[in-house]
Interface confidence: medium
Amino acid sequence: HSDGIFTDSYSRYRKQMAVKKYLAAVLGKRYKQRVKNK
């Protein structure tokens, strides 16, 4: 079901956000905030 796929994808996105915020704020790893074109 498409809604289920969307929800699962969004959940993974939110978890990814949480991990990266943790890395930025707690471990001091500053990410690039945009993708650079090669």
Epitope: Q16, K21, L23, L27, G28, R30, Q33, R34
Partner: antibody, heavy 126, light 114 residues
Framework: QSLEESGGGLVQPEGSLTLTCTAS?????????MCWVRQAPGKGLEWIGC???????NTYYATWAQGRFTISKTSTTVTLEMTSLTAADTATYFC????????????????????WGPGTLVTVSS | DVVMTQTPSPVSAQVGGTVTINCQAS??????LSWYQQKPGQPPKLLIY???TLESGVPSRFKGSGSGTDYTLTISDLECADAAIYYC????????????????FGGGTEVVVK
């Protein structure tokens, strides 16, 4: 809350110098960085680098500063070690707190320099 | 590294007037831009962060805008105390794998109040 730089003064070309930034009224926390910025007489601001105030102590430097400049920290101070100094390094050196501002719905925090020290003058001359 | 270019400098206006300062990044910085005010013999003072958010205590006469590579600081109802040099700063993060940074400042714009 305040920051104060010390250790500036006259240094010979090719010499070394270590500047110290002391924090008062607040303690380093895990969502901020301490940074160094310099300003040559009559010129603009030039970012040198930052150190994460959390346990990792990760450092980030401007491309031009890598190799000659080293940032380190203790629980209440941050130091900037400078080597192979030349006249071009003559400047007022500021330390600043680089604070995290978390954005709802974004991958990353954004940062801004919300607290600055008064600066300390470094003169490189023979 | 990202390069920040400010124009014009200097810029002048009458008391009560309006000035606009432009800041252009060499590539998109996703609105991670701050503005600072510096007066002679003093350290810079934070005015605006994240393009448009006013720092506490900064008058609403200061307004930031922009996106992508182009950003603007507008000061309205100019006062004599607004005479200073204004700097933009890209506050994008550094690479996770390297120690090079993008916390680059623009060259500064002097505001003269007549």
């Amino acid at each position: 809350q305040s920051l104060e730089e010390s250790g500036g003064g006259l240094v010979q070309p090719e010499g070394s110098l270590t500047l110290t930034c002391t924090a008062s009224g607040f303690s380093f926390n895990s969502s901020s960085y301490m940074c160094w910025v310099r300003q040559a007489p009559g010129k603009g601001l030039e970012w040198i680098g930052c150190i994460f105030t959390g346990s990792s102590g990760n450092t980030y430097y401007a491309t031009w500063a890598q190799g000659r400049f080293t940032i380190s920290k203790t629980s209440t101070t941050v130091t900037l070690e400078m080597t192979s100094l030349t006249a071009a390094d003559t400047a007022t050196y500021f330390c600043a707190r680089d604070r995290a501002y978390f954005l709802v719905g974004y991958f990353y925090a954004t940062y801004y320099f919300d607290l600055w020290g008064p600066g300390t003058l470094v003169t490189v001359s023979s | 590294d990202v390069v920040m270019t400010q124009t014009p400098s200097p810029v002048s206006a009458q008391v009560g007037g309006t000035v606009t300062i432009n800041c252009q990044a060499s590539e998109s910085i996703d609105s991670d831009l701050s503005w600072y005010q510096q007066k002679p013999g003093q350290p810079p003072k934070l005015l605006i962060y994240r393009t448009f958010t006013l720092e506490s205590g900064v008058p609403s006469r200061f307004k930031g805008s922009g996106s992508g590579t182009d950003y603007t600081l507008t000061i309205s109802d100019l006062e004599c105390a607004d005479a200073a040099i204004y700097y933009c700063q890209c506050t994008d993060g550094s690479s996770i794998s390297g120690s090079y940074g993008w916390d680059a400042f623009g060259g500064g714009t002097e505001v003269v109040v007549k």
